[in-house]
Amino acid sequence: LNTTILTPNGNEDATTDFFLTSMPTDSLSVSTLPLPEVQCFVFNVEYMNCTWNSSSEPQPTNLTLHYWYKNSDNDKVQKCSHYLFSEEITSGCQLQKKEIHLYQTFVVQLQDPREPRRQATQMLKLQNLVIPWAPENLTLRKLSESQLELNWNNRFLNHCLEHLVQYRTDWDHSWTEQSVDYRHKFSLPSVDGQKRYTFRVRSRFNPLCGSAQHWSEWSHPIHWGSNSSKENPFLFALEA
């Protein structure tokens, strides 16, 4: 029986092989139990974590992970050399930078060592699974009496990232947001000097170097102005 699973992250279909063994009527052997789905994320192209829900197993099982790259010079099957554990049971594998090849199809295989025929294979496009670190060093600059410019830094090549800026005043119930491309500059043309503003930014590996759906964590917020800003115009750029 060959079952195709549609993965939710825009990657290639994952083909999972379930092997049926001879069995008594009205029962299935352990080899037919589906293995948990493996989820991989590449953090800032520094390392990758591939994890699975170990608690979904009917009994504690140290599942093993192998990987390789399809149709490439790196197509030799590799064993996981750095397992992640949850309550002393394997629940993931960490791969280092030298083992990450973004633009080759990554094949990951999960296996039950006690039942070797029970295995699941998924194919992933790693460039769609990159999550950058949160933006850092937010700064605000006054361009004119009513215009602010927000700048920030990323610990990755700027041109690979797009950004989402959110801001609000103390009077607002919700954030206003604005998409920003790889140039990573944002300006607010009309600032009310009576209000205190809060800004934050997150980044995504899209659309130039990959097609990731997941955003980074939010930056630390930065603030501008205060309720008493008329009396004290130098109260600005207060880091949270």
Epitope: V45, N71, L102, Y103, Q104, L157, H159, C160, P207, L208, C209
Partner: nanobody, 117 residues
Framework: QVQLQESGGGLVQPGGSLRLSCTAS????????MTWARQAPGKGLEWVST????????AYAASVEGRFTISRDNAKSTLYLQLNSLKTEDTAMYYC??????????PGQGTQVTVSS
Amino acid sequence: QVQLQESGGGLVQPGGSLRLSCTASGFSFSSYPMTWARQAPGKGLEWVSTIASDGGSTAYAASVEGRFTISRDNAKSTLYLQLNSLKTEDTAMYYCTKGYGDGTPAPGQGTQVTVSS
């Protein structure tokens, strides 16, 4: 074996144009973003432009935006850079690289662009 061969450089007057090409082999060209970088005499390698694997997205250094245009032909495994309104400060060795320009792998041999009157 990854091979990148740049061509199309030359001597041109300020305000002139050139079209650089980079022919790639030894890897799945259509799977990779591709990047142009340059190195002026006595300077470090400077990122110029990157194009997505499908050609649908591009990015440019501020110094060349609006004057240079990156493009690619995946069927021919070839990357291009159209250089318009050239300035003397564009004088450099121009390199194409596989990927997004993080310095690995090393670029090809390069093609020299000299802008002078």
